[in-house]
């Protein structure tokens, strides 16, 4: 039963943290203006992996593509591909899992090929969620170099845009959104990964055997001595329903009134 | 067509308090943020401040903070400001107008002329 | 706040005339994130409310004649009028709509001789 609810539980958590890492790579709040010196401002820009936004006082936003692979900072290039891998493991994971779940029967499959593909999905989670991790990382150290950097002509690394000082960027919400997400993948794949070790047919059972002493009809049955993992209950032959848990993947955004892309 | 029509002009004691009122009209009230300029003398502009009425977010110039207070009733459509304890600068004409693409006022109210005096 | 220098306060022309007058920003009004300058100008004649002529610096409001220019960026704008008409004489104002408070010049009165 704790094998289930470890598997049911990683494969929960991964699935929220997929999509959280998906959300964080659609977002557009990768970096948002600093407003340290000007709390209220007519004009606010933010920059995303895929294009940069400005939101006026008047309550228009302009989204801008950037609508140049070349142009783009090795950097940024290198961001959105961690993203991406992070995102195509993940779904691949989730889609492994799905049949690994020891909840859901499909035919004859044996525990063993169950307890390997919870394996799997689990290392395809954790490589997902450090992808994501790095990927926000990776941004996020971009930020802070060039949030120090006081030269007139500071480079931004975003979409190769030459800017004045006084336009500074910090973190936007979604590297806590990928940071939170990345790390939400990387437990569920650590669950999966136990709960696979509490899968593995590892049972020895002894079939009962009658020793006829003389003069006694005594029968020893020395009964199914277990080889015992460490990790919860055996719950071999038991149909365990989980009560049908389920997970919405609701990315809520907050769209301005008028998003001109 | 889009239309500011604002509350009439006002003789008002010193130390008094107002409100003009600017009923907008021929679009969504809500998609578009509100502003309040004064005019002094028929030259100087003074921006006062801004409320957004879809959720009645405002900002404000330093200058008019206190003196000013930036109000909407998104039912009637109407943009409202406050002006508490007026004096004699205080004397002028006030536009309400609307806030479109780079922050400009593309419509603005015919003013309201204020006059404080005792 | 930033301050908004207008010059000439006056300009005396000629129907027909080429006129272009002056603004100066303290600061810049160029946003880098998408490259516009948030500079407005209005055109405002006696008993009237302004009127918009030009926001970002450049972009032509709908229903303004083509005889209005605006260039500029950073901190140095121009509006140019063409060729001047009966129906130009007004007071010109530019406007910063970077950073708040938004601020006015003072003005250009524009005068037929």
């Known amino acids: 039963m704790a094998v289930t609810a470890c598997q049911g539980l990683g494969f929960v958590v991964s699935l929220i943290g997929i999509a959280g890492i998906i959300a964080a790579t659609c977002m557009d709040q990768w970096s948002t203006q600093d407003l340290y010196n000007n709390p209220v401002t007519a004009v606010f820009n933010y920059q995303g992996l895929w294009r940069s936004c400005v939101r006026e006082s008047s309550g228009f936003t302009e989204c801008r593509g950037y609508f140049t692979l070349l142009g783009l900072p090795a950097m940024l290039q290198a961001v959105r591909a961690l993203m991406i891998v992070g995102i195509v493991l993940g779904a691949i994971g989730l889609l492994v899992s799905i049949f690994a779940l020891k909840c859901i029967r499909i035919g004859s499959m044996e525990d063993s090929a169950k307890a390997n593909m919870t394996l799997t999905s689990g290392i395809m989670f954790i490589v997902s969620g450090l992808c994501a991790i790095a990927g926000v990382s990776v941004f996020a150290n971009m930020l802070v170099t060039n949030f120090w950097m006081s030269t007139a002509n500071m480079y931004t690394g975003m979409g190769g845009m030459v800017q004045t000082v006084q336009t500074r960027y910090t973190f936007g919400a979604a590297l806590f959104v990928g940071w939170v997400a990345g790390g939400l993948t990387l437990i569920g794949g650590v669950m999966m990964c136990i709960a696979c070790r509490g899968l593995a047919p590892e049972e020895t059972n002894y079939k009962a055997v009658s020793y006829h002493a003389s003069g006694h009809s005594v029968a020893y049955k020395p009964g199914g001595f277990k080889a015992s993992t460490g990790f919860g209950s055996n719950t071999k032959n038991k149909k365990i329903y989980d009560g049908g848990a389920r997970t919405e993947d609701e990315v809520q955004s907050y769209p301005s009134k008028h998003d001109y892309v | 067509e889009v239309q500011l029509q604002q509350s009439g002009p006002e003789l008002v004691k010193p130390g008094a308090s107002m409100k003009i009122s600017c009923k907008a009209s021929g679009y969504s009230f809500t998609g578009y943020t509100m502003n309040w300029v004064k005019q002094s003398h028929g030259k100087n502009l003074e921006w006062i401040g801004l409320?957004?009425?879809?959720?009645?977010?405002?900002s404000y110039n330093q200058k008019f903070k206190g003196k000013a207070t930036l109000t909407v009733d998104k039912s009637s459509s109407t943009a409202y400001m406050e002006l508490l304890s007026l004096t004699s600068e205080d004397s002028a004409v006030y536009y309400c107008a609307r806030m479109n693409y780079g922050n400009a006022m593309d419509y603005w109210g015919q003013g309201t002329s204020v006059t404080v005096s005792s | 706040d930033i301050v908004m220098t207008q010059s000439p306060s006056s300009l005396t022309v000629t129907a027909g005339e080429k006129v272009t007058m002056s603004c100066k920003s303290s600061q810049s009004l160029l946003n880098s994130g998408n490259q516009k300058n948030y500079l407005t100008w209005y055109q405002q004649k006696p008993g009237q409310p302004p009127k918009l002529l030009i926001y970002?610096?450049?972009t032509r409001e709908s229903g303004v004649p083509d005889r209005f220019t605006g260039s500029g960026s950073g901190t140095d704008f121009t509006l140019t009028i063409s060729s001047v008409q009966a129906e130009d004489l007004a007071v010109y104002y530019c406007?910063?709509?970077?950073?708040?408070?938004?601020?006015f010049g003072a003005g250009t009165k524009l005068e037929l001789k």
């Open positions: 409320i957004n009425p879809y959720n009645g977010g405002t």
């Open positions: 970002w610096a450049s």
């Open positions: 406007q910063n709509d970077y950073s708040y408070p938004l601020t």
